[in-house]
């Protein structure tokens, strides 16, 4: 008796497709030794047709895989387009050879059933509409037109023309005739149910002169797609019910015992468990829809069902398309922080991974929100606008060929609390949700910049001061001017720097920043922050004013400011300036062309700043001080 | 909620045959694997077979101990699901259970009982020596 099992027999149709599942022993030797899937010849020998080695054979080409799923001790081989060629005996089995362990599978596929010349074959899905299609001759244009269904030797009537209808296909079946057809009717079964498949006989007039039609019908439970995804993935239900259901409310469900709980409806229903990671998008109006969820969880494997009811709950008899998802532990996706905590007027700096095959990439940040299906508007991104509300105290940091993006956030507030995507316009698997929890600050920030109330005069010069605490000491300190493309870094001086670290004076740490002389063009935000290498910390900001010099205020030589600004020895002065050009950058539509359910993109990248070169010339001067 | 009731159990001799029926009613759209499970006297239940259908495919599986002599087939119409027996031995005696499931394939395992939301409430299969 073999240690391995699975179906002993398989039967299906041509055309169709199988899921054959076979269970090993769980030893650790079984999980990584050799899958294989043979065909037993009459000569004994069993020809391998796929195999967890990467073998194919020629005639499974472009129709066959084998997973192995480790954590569950088991392999699947999937097989499409079937033919009665495959009708045969085989073998799935484990081991170097195909002699190792092993479980024989009987594979039978048949055509489509035949039935007498007079029989009519519908085949439908379940919760569809099948039309039946009764002839007759005129001589019974008149009498009574019925549909029955063939129960053992009995035909239990369904429906008549004389208005009778069967108590199980009330409201369901209708029987009618179209235009000035004197020799045809119809009989429209609607909702279909398993139950509802067999051999139908319709039937216009009685006794012998009695004209009669077969009608099989066929009612098929839907076959799920198997859907294959690593951990902190994500994954896209597609679903296409149908124009007859354009107008009922959709749905996503996960099965569950006898039921099918509710992950998502467009009436608003949302399971908690998917909370800040899934997007619910109407793709047209015939009824199509998507369903998007990210950061998915071990837990997340399961059989999915899409589905629509005026209710937005799972009906028997209404159409449904199944999926059965896998996640894969073995993932290439990093781990990285699901939720990140910030407290109010403070910062974060949240790190996106991206494939890092794709560092030419457009990278996104958008905020979930919870409203109707849910939606994620973008707030910034390499080509975006940076959303209103969100200037001067957000930005995105891509660090090319590191495989991740760092997106800045400062000026914290309680209502920046929620759920917020990283995804690129590539590899759309890399699409990471986290959740930011803001609390109350409890005490004052690390970073602190003087002076606060940021008046620059034109033509004169100003720096501006920022305070960090001797914990950031060994860390970069760097002042940057926001733009809506980004934070560019710009000469700065730190003055703790020079002290040994042993002696650290918590109230001389001192990263400043010289305009020098003030522009108009130096208005605007400014970033003081700490970053290790491509690793962003805190980040604290300012808004400058500039302003005309006023009558009677008085002037100051810049080279006065500088001498003044000379108390420490060894201090050298830097000089250096930023020059911003303005153009128009669009928005990748490749981004948005499969995805519409990351929302309100499009509109942002109307009006996007592109950066000229942040290193270059003209407006701004650092100077040491 | 579905409801399983089985039928067909009775007295045998050895070597003869025994039909099971397990007729399904309620909520039977959601049911896509229906198991035989047995309990003999004083020992543990024991898988049997099942059928998983998917689409137009169905899977069918067999403990080691009735392969060759146990079928399990289903009529769709009447939501019914049979266990042909053949070759009855005494080893076979036992309350026979019918199970089902709405989760289809791949799914759980089918010889585990945990694999299984619906229970019927068994019928006994006695075949004397």
């Known amino acids: 008796q073999s240690p391995i099992f699975g179906p002993q027999d398989v039967s299906s149709i041509e055309g169709n497709s199988v899921s054959i599942t076979c269970y090993y022993p769980d030893t650790s030797v079984n999980r990584h030794t050799r899958k294989y899937w043979c065909r037993q010849g009459a000569n004994g020998y069993c020809a391998t047709l796929i195999s967890s080695n990467g073998y194919l054979s020629k005639e499974y080409s472009g129709r066959a895989s084998l997973i192995n799923f480790p954590e569950n001790s088991t392999f699947v081989i999937n097989i499409a387009h079937l033919t009665q060629e495959d009708t045969g005996s085989y073998k799935c089995g484990l081991g170097t050879t195909n002699r190792g362990l092993f479980f024989d599978v009987s594979l039978e596929v048949s055509q489509v059933p035949e039935f007498p010349n007079d029989t009519h074959v519908y085949t439908k899905d379940i919760g569809r509409t099948v039309t039946i299609e009764c002839r007759f001759k005129e001589g019974n244009a008149h009498s009574k037109k019925s549909l029955c269904k063939k129960r053992g030797e009995a035909c239990e009537v369904v429906i008549d023309s004389t208005e009778y209808v069967d108590p199980s296909y009330k409201d369901r079946a209708i029987l009618f005739m179209k235009g000035t057809s004197r020799d045809i009717f119809y009989v429209n079964i609607s909702h279909l149910i398993p139950s509802d498949a067999g051999l139908y006989v319709c039937q216009a007039g009685e006794g012998p002169s009695a004209d009669k039609n077969n009608a099989d019908l066929q009612v098929l439970e839907p076959e799920p797609e198997l859907l294959y995804k690593d951990l902190r993935s994500s994954v896209t239900f597609e679903c296409d019910l149908g124009r007859e259901v354009a107008n009922d409310a959709k749905y996503l469900c996960r099965k569950n015992k006898e039921t099918c709980d509710v992950i998502i409806n467009t009436l608003g229903k949302r399971d908690p468990a998917f909370e800040g990671r899934i997007l619910l998008t109407p793709r047209d109006d015939n009824g199509r829809f998507s369903v998007l969820i990210t950061g998915l969880r071990k837990e997340d494997a399961g059989h999915y069902q899409c589905g629509a009811h005026s209710s937005g709950l799972p009906q028997e008899g209404w159409p449904v398309q199944a999926w059965q998802l896998f996640v894969n532990e073995e993932s290439t996706i990093p781990n990285s922080r699901s939720v990140v905590k910030g407290v109010t007027g403070g910062s974060v700096a949240i790190v996106c991974p991206y494939n890092p095959k794709e560092s030419s990439s457009l990278k996104y940040w958008c905020h979930w929100e919870a409203d109707e299906n849910g939606r994620c508007p973008v707030l910034v991104g390499t080509q975006a606008l940076v959303q209103e509300g969100y200037e001067g105290r957000l930005a995105l940091f891509d660090q090319p060929g590191s495989g991740a993006y760092t997106v800045i956030l400062n000026q914290l507030t309680t209502q920046d609390s929620g759920f917020y995507w990283c995804l690129t316009d590539g590899d759309s698997r890399w699409r990471t949700t986290i959740e930011l929890q803001v609390a109350e600050a409890t005490k004052k920030p690390d970073l602190e910049v003087t002076p606060q109330n940021a008046t620059a005069v034109i033509g004169e010069t100003f720096t501006i001061s920022c305070h960090y605490p001797c914990k950031f000491y060994s860390q970069e300190k760097y002042w940057c001017k926001w733009s809506n493309d980004g934070c560019h870094i710009l000469p700065s001086h730190d003055e703790g720097a020079r002290q040994s670290s042993v002696s650290c004076d918590q109230s001389s740490q001192i990263v400043s920043m010289t305009l020098n002389p003030v522009k108009k063009e130096d208005e605007g935000w400014y970033w003081c922050g700490v970053k290790e290498g491509q690793v962003y910390g805190e980040t604290t900001a300012i808004y400058v004013a500039v302003e005309e010099r006023t009558r009677g205020s008085p002037h100051i030589n810049p080279t006065d400011a500088n001498a003044r600004a000379k108390d420490a020895p060894e201090e050298e002065a830097m000089e250096s300036s930023v020059r911003e050009d303005e153009n128009k950058a669009n928005l990748d539509p490749r981004l948005f062309a499969d995805e519409r359910e990351i929302q309100n993109a499009g509109d942002q990248a109307q009006e996007n700043r592109a950066s000229g070169n942040a290193g270059s010339a003209g407006g701004q001067s650092g100077s040491s001080k | 909620q579905v409801q399983l009731v089985e039928s067909g159990g009775g007295l045998v001799q050895t070597g003869g045959s025994l039909r099971l029926s397990c007729a399904a009613s309620?909520?039977?759209?959601?049911?896509?694997?229906v198991g035989w499970f047995r309990q003999a006297p004083g020992k543990e239940r024991e898988f049997v077979a099942a059928?998983?259908?998917?689409?137009?495919?169905?899977?069918?599986y067999a403990a080691d101990s009735v392969k060759g002599r146990f079928t399990i087939s289903r009529d769709n119409a009447e939501n019914t699901v049979y266990l042909q027996m053949n070759s009855l031995k005494p080893e076979d005696t036992a309350v026979y259970y019918c199970?089902?499931?709405?989760?289809?394939?791949?799914?759980?395992?089918?010889?585990?009982?945990?694999?299984?939301?619906?229970w019927g409430q068994g019928t006994l299969v006695t075949v004397s020596s």
């Open positions: 199970a089902a499931d709405p989760l289809g394939l791949p799914g759980p395992d089918v010889r585990v009982e945990g694999g299984y939301r619906h």
């Open positions: 309620g909520r039977t759209f959601s049911v896509y694997r």
């Open positions: 059928v998983i259908w998917s689409g137009a495919s169905t899977y069918k």
